[in-house]
Amino acid sequence: QPSVSPGEPSPPSIHPAKSELIVRVGNEIRLLCIDPGFVKWTFEILDETNENKQNEWITEKAEATNTGKYTCTNKHGLSSSIYVFVRDPAKLFLVDRSLYGKEDNDTLVRCPLTDPEVTSYSLKGCQGKPLPKDLRFVPDPKAGITIKSVKRAYHRLCLHCSADQEGKSVLSDKFILKVRPAFKAVPVVSVSKASYLLREGEEFTVTCTIKDVSSSVYSTWKRENSQTKLQEKYNSWHHGDFNYERQATLTISSARVNDSGVFMCYANNTFGSANVTTTLEVVDKGFINIFPMINTTVFVNDGENVDLIVEYEAFPKPEHQQWIYMNRTFTDKWEDYPKSENESNIRYVSELHLTRLKGTEGGTYTFLVSNSDVNASIAFNVYVNTKPEILTYDRLVNGMLQCVAAGFPEPTIDWYFCPGTEQRCSASVLPVDVQTLNASGPPFGKLVVQSSIDSSAFKHNGTVECKAYNDVGKTSAYFNFAFKGNNKEQIHPHTLFTP
């Protein structure tokens, strides 16, 4: 009871002057509050509160539910309390069966005793099951039993308060502990696709998956740099306790070019926030853009291989691809494949494999591709480099020696005179006339060059060499001369191949 010091307000006095009182069920509770400035009695148990404005609290026939704390308050706001136990052998515990705990926090199992003289006040598992090994608790007869540092593993744990009364173990009604998880990480968010490419009028639909320990995770779709509320649909599942998944689907039923932009799926919990974005590009119509991977003018040596390679962007998906040469479509020798297996891939590769090219196979090779909206093509000009071939080497009636050579690039023809029997023809002879014969003909294939010299310039026996050469190689033809008197006579010409 409070001690009184004169001059300053003191708390009320209670009779009987005890901190605790034990009353048998059915007997009277009589409590007197002594204070000149009495205001009220308050009774509290299990979050229930009753008030009485009389200075004497009387309960004629006490019941177990009258167990609790009785507080007398005066006009100065000062108070004194007494705790009354109403001992009822048939009702040892008062219970509030709702039991919730927050992970890592303590929680109170509300089962205060009606008899403080019982022993072994503790918790027990239902149906004789043991409590979790790490479950620690602290009993308090007036409040109940506090479970220390609640774990997730205790969720839906069934338990009883227990006490030994006159040598017998008594159990309370059962409690089911519901554990609210602590958010110990940000939500896990993912998006169905990182980017979307659509044509005007097509539907845009994107799904964000949010995973967390509770459905109390907040999530929303936002458009970057916009406050407009977006329309979303949700689906959610509990994959067991503390394993929650929500799918938030954002839909624009008929996308417009100005819907293009970045959309963010944002989620947060009490730990923090996370987000993931997706990019939408809406085009007014489909497109195809072709990028050659090699120069579109190709020079290749006779007999060698070349690969014509293009990359192209196509949206929507390409429907027809073909390689064409001289109005002929290739049925094999080419392949077409997506640049990546990614679902949103719009980039493709096409390769035409030309093998052991002949001089006659130069020309324009065209790649054509189309989708439902557009067609596109790219041409490669293929030039086959061939060493010169001497087509004709003749002595004309007018005394001219003529050499005609074909090759690519355009051959150059040089003339040499070898006097007598010398093998090396070093003295060069200037031609009288040089003509490119097919300069106005087809743009690919061999170029034909004709060169002539005047044989009257030669006064001695010997050999005339016509040498045709280009970057690839050289070929020679020879004219043998012998003088009989004043007559110049051409011995059969012959050619020598010089690689």
């Epitope: 509030d96 709702s98 919730y100 929680t107 519901k178 609210r180 509770s214 109390s216 509990h238 306790d241």
Partner: antibody, heavy 119, light 106 residues
Framework: QVQLVQSGAEVKKPGSSVKVSCKAS????????ISWVRQAPGQGLEWMGG????????NYAQKFQGRVTITADESTSTAYMELSSLRSEDTAVYYC????????????WGRGTLVTVSS | DIQMTQSPSSLSASVGDRVTITCRAS??????LNWYQQKPGKAPKLLIY???SLQSGVPSRFSGSGSGTDFTLTISSLQPEDFATYYC????????FGGGTKVEIK
């Protein structure tokens, strides 16, 4: 024992809003899941949404998304449900119940609040 | 949403009868199924939670069974106070209730 005490009946005009309260007496209100379930005359039960006050974020049934707002005031142990753009088919008894989120069963119910929407 | 189909929608029985009500989910809900009893003009009352656990204070004549998609509520011996409407409810996804089964006196 804990009780859920709901506000009284309401008569509302179409297009208006209604806000119903649900006060919990005792217990650890902040950790409860408080849900709202409605029942139209002669019909079944329909979950509208719920909230765990300690976490603050409400969950809503897809049907009511954007039209219902559920809040909770931990200081007064009271949950609220506001339904906007009322139409005649919203005439129903609106129950608050403990449970309904994170797989909690509805183990405690309020007595219900009749909301009549009529012009 | 997960659809909950209850059958029958109504049944007539006599005191002492064994009554069985079934509830089928449109997809698996594990054991996240609860049963409620509702009397006219009253709020529903929880009978069974987690498919088979009896709520405190509910008479032992009520029992529940099942998991996945098929569930059953059984009243072993119908009592006069059991005439009411019974609802099942799933809690794995956005909460949905079955359409109800009205148990009437024969």
């Amino acid at each position: 024992q804990v009780q859920l005490v709901q506000s009284g009946a309401e008569v509302k005009k179409p297009g208006s809003s209604v806000k119903v309260s649900c006060k919990a007496s005792g217990g650890t209100f902040s950790l409860y899941a408080i849900s709202w379930v409605r029942q139209a005359p002669g019909q079944g039960l329909e979950w509208m949404g719920g909230i765990i006050p300690a976490f603050g974020t409400a969950n809503y049934a897809q049907k009511f998304q954007g039209r219902v707002t559920i809040t909770a005031d931990e200081s007064t142990s009271t949950a609220y449900m506001e339904l906007s753009s009322l139409r005649s088919e919203d005439t129903a008894v609106y129950y608050c119940a403990r449970g309904g989120l994170d797989t909690d069963e509805f183990d405690l119910w309020g007595r219900g609040t009749l909301v009549t929407v009529s012009s | 949403d997960i659809q909950m189909t209850q059958s029958p929608s109504s049944l007539s029985a006599s005191v002492g009868d064994r009554v069985t009500i079934t509830c089928r989910a449109s997809q698996s809900i594990n054991s996240y199924l609860n049963w409620y009893q509702q009397k006219p003009g009253k709020a529903p009352k929880l009978l069974i939670y987690a498919a088979s656990s009896l709520q405190s204070g509910v008479p032992s004549r009520f029992s529940g069974s099942g998991s996945g998609t098929d569930f059953t509520l059984t009243i072993s011996s119908l009592q006069p106070e059991d005439f009411a409407t019974y609802y099942c409810q799933q809690g794995v996804s956005d909460i949905t209730f079955g359409g109800g089964t009205k148990v009437e006196i024969k």
